[in-house]
């Protein structure tokens, strides 16, 4: 979380912001919040970016103003304009891409003042992974795909039964580039599995940490899948 | 160059499937916002539905639960499945990559629904 | 679910005349969300203008979009034979994720 305050003669405002992570190929979320004033028309939200000229999105008098915005964000950016008067400034940015990923600055100015917060957003892939029974198999054999990571991740099986036990010898993982050469999918084989336990496959990165578990029985299979994002630090 | 070209339309009975095709060349579908929208005969643009790069997909509600979106990443090739399909399906369809906005659009395959 | 409604639906105009195209959406759409399509008869629609006042890559310079919030604008400053055609406006964003005009068609007085 980083929490800015503005500087100069006038009033400082409080603006919030929180560092987070965009999934390429998925629309993004840079949130920012801020002091809210009373008027609409007295509201300027500018977001800009580190190493960038023009402007990547400007909110002004209760509307969009992208005269100044710089090419790379054109039809991208917005901003949830019935929540501005909330003090919702956050930036919503289409089919986020690697190159989005830098230091972001949310400056406000109100009648009460001014304030930034600057935010770091990351950028990479991640995506729940599946565990199934691989029937294909000599032994009983446990297969955990996940569609897209990137940058590459650490693939950490854990069983319920065998809780700290180190299955790295039983296991193997391969990493497979997807067609637009930047994303991979993530393969991780499990071998010499056993009945009635509870098996993990725990794929992270420095983006996310995604689950999916696996309990098989006698008489059925239950799986289940979570998904984290990491860093997700206020300002 | 950058093209879309589509296929597979055609004369279907009511409740039968087809599955239309869209095929890309210059850039990669993968890594793009890629959309079917349609033109019924004398009428206006209907988005149908959009797939993400990562894979997320979309449906407007006159289709969903019929029509499924797809990509064949190997073959940079997107699908739409249709089902169930009715007469007011018949239309002309169109892919379109949306980057900035919907830049690139095929020629249209066109889809008539009838007994 | 966000509505646009262009007007007017017909617009009749002669070449060199200027002609004002309104799309309005039923509640707030982004500026950057907003773009504006040509369609000739058997063609495919061709983008025109994105972010609202952005011209796509080939589109000449009688064509300019503005507009904010609620009201967009596509204006043509000298008609060219060429340009009567019919004119749609498109979001993206909301539920349903994108949502077209229902048209102006721009025809020869």
């Known amino acids: 979380l980083i929490i800015g305050f503005g500087i100069s003669g006038r009033h400082s405002i409080t603006v919030t912001t929180v560092a987070s992570a965009g999934n390429i190929g998925e629309d993004g979320i840079l949130s920012c919040t801020f002091e809210p004033d009373i008027k609409l028309s007295d509201i300027v939200i500018q977001w800009l970016k580190e190493g960038v000229l023009g402007l990547v999105h400007e909110f002004k008098e209760g509307k969009d103003e992208l005269s100044e915005q710089d090419e790379m964000f054109r039809g991208r950016t917005a901003v949830f304009a019935d929540q501005v008067i909330v003090g919702n400034a956050s930036l919503r940015l289409k089919n986020v891409q690697l190159t989005d990923a830098g230091t972001y600055k949310c400056y406000i100015i109100t009648s009460k003042g001014k304030g930034n917060a600057n935010l770091e957003y990351k950028t990479g892939a991640f995506s729940m992974p599946e565990v199934n029974v691989d029937y294909n198999a000599s032994s009983e054999t446990l297969r955990c795909e996940a569609p897209r990571w990137f940058p590459q991740p650490t693939v950490v099986w854990a069983s319920q039964v065998d809780q700290g036990a180190n299955f790295s010898e039983v296991s193997n993982t391969s990493f497979e580039l997807n067609s637009e050469n930047v994303t991979m999918k993530v393969v991780s084989v499990l071998y010499n599995v056993t009945i009635n336990n509870t098996y993990s496959c725990m794929i992270e990165n420095d983006i996310a940490k995604a689950t999916g578990d696996i309990k098989v029985t006698e008489s059925e299979i239950k799986r289940r899948s979570h998904l984290q994002l990491l860093n997700s630090k206020a300002s | 160059e950058v093209q879309l070209v589509e296929s597979g339309g055609g004369l279907i009975q009511p409740g039968g499937s087809l599955r239309l095709s869209c095929a890309a060349s210059?850039?990669?579908?993968?890594?793009?916002?890629m959309n079917w929208v349609r033109q019924a005969p004398g009428k206006g643009l209907e988005w149908v539905s959009v797939?993400?790069?990562?894979?997320?997909?979309y449906y407007a509600d006159s289709v969903k639960g019929r029509v499924t979106i797809s990509r064949d990443n190997s073959k940079n090739t997107l699908y739409l499945q249709m089902n169930s399909l009715r007469a007011e399906d018949t239309a002309v369809y169109y892919c379109?990559?949306?980057?900035?906005?919907?830049?690139?659009w095929g020629q249209g395959t066109t889809v008539t629904v009838s007994s | 679910e966000i509505v646009l409604t262009q007007s007017p639906g017909t617009l009749s105009l002669s070449p060199g005349e200027r002609a004002t195209l309104s799309c309005r959406a039923s509640?707030?759409?982004?500026?950057?969300?907003l773009a504006w399509y040509q369609q000739k008869p058997g063609q495919a629609p061709r983008l025109l203008i994105y972010g609202a006042s952005s011209r796509a890559t080939g589109i000449p310079d009688r064509f300019s979009g503005s507009g904010s919030g609620t009201d967009f604008t596509l204006t043509i400053s000298r008609l060219e034979p060429e340009d009567f055609a019919v004119y749609y406006c498109?979001?993206?964003?909301?539920?349903?994720?994108?949502?077209f005009g229902q048209g102006t068609k721009l025809e020869i007085k």
């Open positions: 797939i993400y790069g990562s894979g997320r997909t």
């Open positions: 509640q707030s759409v982004s500026s950057s969300y």
């Open positions: 210059g850039f990669t579908v993968s890594s793009n916002y």
């Open positions: 379109a990559r949306d980057t900035y906005a919907m830049d690139v």
């Open positions: 498109q979001q993206y964003g909301s539920s349903p994720m994108y949502t």
